[in-house]
């Protein structure tokens, strides 16, 4: 029988590159078995992550995965940076990885790239 | 149900590039972690990299200098270009989703055999 | 890169008969609080097949002859009985950091 403990699926050294200006949801893949866990977001700044309290979140249950989401809409320059959620569950507080927002700034490229350009482009 | 099904050449020669296509049907590479394997002629099998639900892709460091991972999602393929390949490349490769809840490949293709031979 | 290392290589099992699969990890499996460790079975000529996820749950549809155990380093694929069906390759795969890795591969044959 599978474990009921909270657990926080965000990808460890996860990355997605973004434009500003489009919309974006950060999923926060959560486990959980009866009761759905009180869980938040927040923005590294330095060692200390800062709760985003005025941002629009919502929950998305998806073929028996359940999803904490952090809207942007739209994605904005400053929305630069790593990512943690947190559950609390049983007085336990679980934090995820960080994950990173790499926002591009639309008014400084000179082409705007399609999204799957975007998602595609390589560094080697 | 999810099916993935891998296409591309059989035969490449030396210092070529080796495109594959992983064509998905019954979800969305919009959502979840989208991956190629290989598995070479000893049962070896490699990692060879994702790409994600908003695109952004992760290479096996081993790989990073001649891989490359895109994706058409208005076709729902996902795309492997391996460039310089030499006769190490010759492998069995495979795609396969990652489950959210902790990576595993609960679905793959059925893989395509690739020689790399003048 | 975390290394995981399979014993035995191969094994011959009588029908009936129990088959232990060892896998052991360079580093500890369990930066997300839970051990992303899995186990696949490939037949000749066909992809693997996810057998057990997350060390000990079993894949839907997989037989209850299979079972997963272990943590932190070191990890064991049961299979008991055996049936003739089973004779394949079974492989390890680590998901808790990148590049994922798997083990060597684990070849049971039927006694």
């Known amino acids: 029988k599978e474990s009921c403990d909270v657990q926080l699926y965000i990808k460890r050294q996860s990355e997605h590159s973004i434009l500003a200006g489009d919309p974006f949801e950060l999923e926060c893949p959560v486990k959980y078995c009866a009761n759905r866990p009180h869980v938040t977001w927040c923005k590294l700044n330095g060692t200390t992550c800062v709760k985003l309290e005025d941002r629009q979140t919502s929950w998305k249950e998806e073929k028996n995965i359940s999803f904490f989401i952090l809207h942007f809409e739209p994605v904005l320059p400053n929305d630069n940076g790593s990512y943690r959620c947190s559950a609390n569950f049983q007085s336990n507080l679980i934090e995820s990885h960080s994950t990173t927002l790499r926002v591009t700034d639309v008014k400084s490229a000179s082409e705007r790239p399609s999204k799957d350009e975007m998602a595609s482009r390589f560094w080697a | 149900e999810v099916q993935l099904q891998e296409s591309g050449p059989s035969l490449v020669k030396p210092s070529q590039t080796l495109s594959l296509t992983c064509s998905v049907t019954?979800?969305?590479?919009?959502?979840?972690?989208w991956n190629w394997i290989r598995k070479f002629p000893g049962n070896k099998l490699e990692y060879m990299g994702y790409?994600?639900?908003?695109?952004?892709?992760y290479f096996n460091p081993s790989l990073k200098s001649r891989i490359s991972i895109t994706r058409n999602t208005s076709k729902n393929q996902y795309y492997l270009q391996l460039n310089s390949v030499t006769t190490e490349d010759t492998a069995t490769y495979y795609c396969?989703?990652?489950?959210?809840?902790?990576?595993?490949?609960?679905?793959w293709g059925h893989g395509t055999t690739l020689t790399v031979s003048s | 890169d975390i290394v995981l290392t399979q014993s035995p290589a191969s094994l011959a099992v009588s029908l009936g008969q129990r088959a232990t699969i060892s896998c052991r990890a360079s580093?500890?499996?369990?930066?997300?609080?839970?051990?992303?460790m899995h186990w696949y079975q490939q037949k000749a000529g066909q992809p693997p097949k996810l057998l057990i996820y997350?060390?000990?749950n079993l894949e839907s549809g997989i037989p209850a002859r299979f079972s997963g155990s272990g943590s932190r380093t070191d990890f064991t694929l049961t299979i008991n009985p055996v049936e003739a069906d089973d004779v394949a390759t079974y492989y390890c795969?680590?998901?808790?950091?990148?590049?994922?890795?798997f083990g060597g591969g684990t070849k049971l044959e039927i006694k």
């Open positions: 795969q680590q998901t808790d950091e990148d590049p994922y890795t």
């Open positions: 997350r060390a000990s």
């Open positions: 790409i994600s639900y908003s695109g952004s892709t």
């Open positions: 580093e500890t499996i369990d930066s997300y609080g839970d051990s992303l």
């Open positions: 396969a989703r990652s489950h959210y809840y902790g990576y595993y490949f609960d679905y």
């Open positions: 019954g979800d969305s590479i919009t959502s979840a972690y």
